[in-house]
């Protein structure tokens, strides 16, 4: 529960770094990694695909996954905009956040609960995670009802974003 | 896609900084800028106004805009609390995040979908963005149905917040 | 509104640190504190309890509270997953974020608004805060309708998370 050596409590004599400032600097949490990707225009499966021409820095994109290149504690956030043509029953919209293909967190919202066939119902769903990730860890997003993700009228609203909060070097 | 020189891969001989530790230090991502503003009590237009007596550090507030003073990658998040006296039809609540007056991201939710005139319906809507912003970039928020933003019973719930994740010096 | 001395504008001659690089380093915002806790399985009161075996670094957990150990500007975010068996009237779900037992921010959403007794309605609610916190400050979460928090089918979805953005040493 304690904070590892930072310059406030760095050993000045002896120990790992002593007074070697370059050594101290090399240990400092300077690393920055981040990504901000928008959903692909045409979705055809529950695992979402993303536009790889988004912001990517210190992270790779491959086959619908963000792939971690630097280990550490990451803040991950995904937000999706749904547009549902209500059927006669209610609809459960689900957003799953997966780490290495394991569901780590999900969010659910029920829409069209009145059972009335209204023209359109909008719903926005987000999900976040703060987790330690190793090199080559994959991050992906799954949505049961991908046909309701609004990629045409609101193409910029569906995003997956991460940033490295604290590197674990 | 790689991370620019950080102390882990700083050139020790020659190059820009060599072993000049002060030079290295001056390059380190120490800059911090942030803001956390609550919505103004009296709203009269779709572009929201904010209480300028909130938290402002390394960011200016002017005429409903947050104005960037240090370039870099910013995390931006806005959250609004709506209170709708349902009419006989459904209501679409929208939150638009604008950068330099261009819509960068929006969130929509439909309420009162049953078509019943209920007393009150609460809805909470949030929106985030991770984006590179230059000096003098403006950040603003637009809401079609500003009359539904609950500034009286829930005055602290409607906020616009940003923080600099990585400076681009 | 200006940023306090950082290495970009550190005084090189005279002043607090002069060219004492260790002094400069000791002032740098290296401190990192964070937490990511999932809700306890069995809830029996409106003040939520959390699993203390989550991620805790530079923060303590005690009696339903996160307790700050290092002063600074913190980003706080809570997300809850509700599952409501609709009664004949609408239900207001509320999430309160408390700092030192004072409500700092709350989010409300109305579900079951159609007045129909549907089988289940899912709703997801989140709340964030960016605030300066002193040592021993407590952070807690209150929910009127804790019986609707879905700890059985979705035990991982209900989380309270914080991270230190900027330390105030």
């Amino acid at each position: 529960d304690s904070i590892p050596n930072s310059p406030d409590n760095v050993p000045l004599k002896g120990g790992d770094c002593s007074e070697d400032l370059l050594c101290i600097l090399k240990r400092a949490p300077f690393k920055k990694s981040w990504a901000y990707l928008q959903v692909a225009k045409h979705l055809d499966k529950t695992k979402l695909s993303w536009n790889k021409d988004g912001i990517l820095h210190g992270v790779r994109y491959q086959d619908g996954n963000l792939v971690i290149q630097f280990p550490g504690l990451y803040f991950i956030i995904c937000q999706l905009q749904f547009l549902v043509q209500c059927p006669q029953n209610s609809v459960d919209l689900k957003l799953e956040l997966l780490i290495n293909k394991h569901i780590k967190k999900q969010a659910l919202v029920t829409v069209c609960e009145s059972g009335m066939q209204t023209k359109h119902v909008y719903q926005n769903l987000s999900q976040f995670l703060l987790d330690y990730l190793q090199v080559d860890t994959t991050i992906s997003v799954n949505v049961d009802t991908f046909q309701y993700i609004d990629t045409s009228t609101f193409p910029l609203e569906n995003v997956l974003s991460i940033f490295l909060y604290s590197n674990s070097d | 896609d790689s991370i620019p020189n950080s102390p882990d891969n700083v050139p020790l001989k020659g190059g820009d900084c060599s072993e000049d530790l002060l030079c290295i230090l001056k390059r380190a991502p120490f800059k911090k800028s942030w803001a956390y503003l609550q919505v103004a009590k009296h709203l009269d237009k779709t572009k929201l106004s904010w209480n300028k007596d909130g938290i402002l550090h390394g960011v200016r507030y002017q005429d409903g805009n947050l104005v960037i003073q240090f370039p870099g990658l910013y995390f931006i998040i806005c959250q609004l609390q709506f209170l709708v006296q349902c009419p006989q039809n459904s209501v679409d609540l929208k939150l638009e995040l604008l950068i330099n007056k261009h819509i960068k991201k929006q969130a929509l939710v439909t309420v009162c979908e049953s078509g019943m005139q209920t007393k009150h319906v609460y809805q909470n809507l949030s929106q985030f963005l991770l984006d590179y912003l230059q000096v003098d970039t403006t950040i603003s928020v637009n809401v079609d149905t500003f009359q539904y933003i609950d500034t009286s019973t829930f005055p602290l719930e409607n906020v616009l917040s940003i923080f600099l994740y990585s400076n681009s010096d | 509104d200006s940023i306090p001395n950082s290495p970009d504008n550190v005084p090189l001659k005279g002043g607090d640190c002069s060219e004492d690089l260790l002094c400069i380093l000791k002032r740098a915002p290296f401190k990192k504190s964070w937490a990511y806790l999932q809700v306890a399985k069995h809830l029996d009161k409106t003040k939520l309890s959390w699993n203390k075996d989550g991620i805790l670094h530079g923060v303590r957990y005690q009696d339903g509270n996160l307790v700050i150990q290092f002063p600074g500007l913190y980003f706080i975010i809570c997300q809850l997953q509700f599952l409501v068996q609709c009664p004949q009237n609408s239900v207001d779900l509320k999430l309160e974020l408390l700092i030192n037992k004072h409500i700092k921010k709350q989010a409300l959403v109305t579900v079951c608004e159609s007045g129909m007794q549907t089988k289940h309605v899912y709703q997801n609610l989140s709340q964030f805060l960016l605030d300066y916190l002193q040592v021993d400050t407590t952070i807690s979460v209150n929910v009127d309708t804790f019986q609707y928090i879905d700890t059985s089918t979705f035990p991982l979805e209900n989380v309270l998370s914080i991270f230190l953005y900027s330390n105030s040493d």
Partner: antibody
Framework: QVQLQESGPRLVKPSETLSLTCTVS????????WSWIRQPAGKGLEWIGR???????NYKPSLKSRVTMSVDTSKNQFSLRLNSVTAADTAVYYC??????????????????WGQGTSVTVSS | QSALTQPASVSGSPGQSITISCTGS?????????VSWYQQYPGKAPELMIY???NRPSGVSDRFSGSTSGNTASLTISGLQANDEADYYC??????????FGGGTKLTVL
């Protein structure tokens, strides 16, 4: 300064509806919560509920099914309706302003201005 | 939603200090620092003496002070005076955006 005055019938028959009005003078009814509290003879205070100037309400759970509160901003008044009354509803009824000042945080500061109270008896 | 629990009566001599306790639950005093205290003379409306645990409205004597610990709040009156003889009620903001009162304590100045 703000003053409150309760008004309404002093006698109500069982199973009927108790209706009271509180008139606010010396200040505006807007941007405040307004509460109703009652006190049976020789007993303690019981909070019934509150109404915001926008019409938003919160009621004591055990009374929720029988209570309705509303606001008339044009008359600077707020009112209480209690349905299906019984002898147990006999009490002195007070209206009060909730001291709810908001700056950078909420203040739920209790009731700082009270009416003098009106005695209501439920009897046939 | 049960009432807060107060002792039915307390007494003290002039000049002494007395403390009135008010026990609630984790849904009110245990969660919120929104505890207030009222003084009520016979046949009169209550008057706010303390708000937010330990704050006094202007005009209230500094002999009145409040505190909380866990699910219990306390009102202390120091330098007891004859005109302190009255009924005292605690109140706390509670979950579901409601208020709850205590049963009241009769203070007798001997």
């Amino acid at each position: 300064q703000v003053q409150l005055q309760e008004s309404g019938p002093r006698l109500v028959k069982p199973s009927e509806t108790l209706s009271l009005t509180c008139t606010v003078s010396g200040g505006s009814i807007t941007n405040n919560y307004w509460s109703w509290i009652r006190q049976p003879a020789g007993k303690g205070l019981e909070w019934i509920g509150r109404v915001y100037s926008s019409g938003l309400t919160n009621y004591k759970p055990s009374l929720k099914s029988r209570v309705t509160m509303s606001v008339d901003t044009s008359k600077n008044q707020f009112s209480l309706r209690l349905n299906s009354v019984t002898a147990a509803d006999t009490a002195v009824y007070y209206c009060a302003r909730e001291r709810a000042t908001v700056t950078t945080r909420y203040h739920y500061d209790g009731m700082d201005v009270w009416g003098q109270g009106t005695s209501v008896t439920v009897s046939s | 939603q049960s009432a807060l629990t107060q002792p039915a009566s307390v007494s003290g001599s002039p000049g002494q200090s007395i403390t009135i306790s008010c026990t609630g639950s984790s849904s009110d005093i245990g969660t919120y620092n929104y505890v207030s205290w009222y003084q009520q003379y016979p046949g009169k409306a209550p008057e706010l003496m303390i708000y937010e645990v330990n704050n006094r409205p202007s005009g209230v004597s500094d002999r009145f002070s409040g505190s909380t610990s866990g699910n219990t709040a306390s009102l202390t009156i120091s330098g007891l005076q004859a005109n302190d003889e009255a009924d005292y009620y605690c109140s706390s903001y509670s979950s579901s955006s409601t208020w709850v009162f205590g049963g009241g304590t009769k203070l007798t100045v001997l």
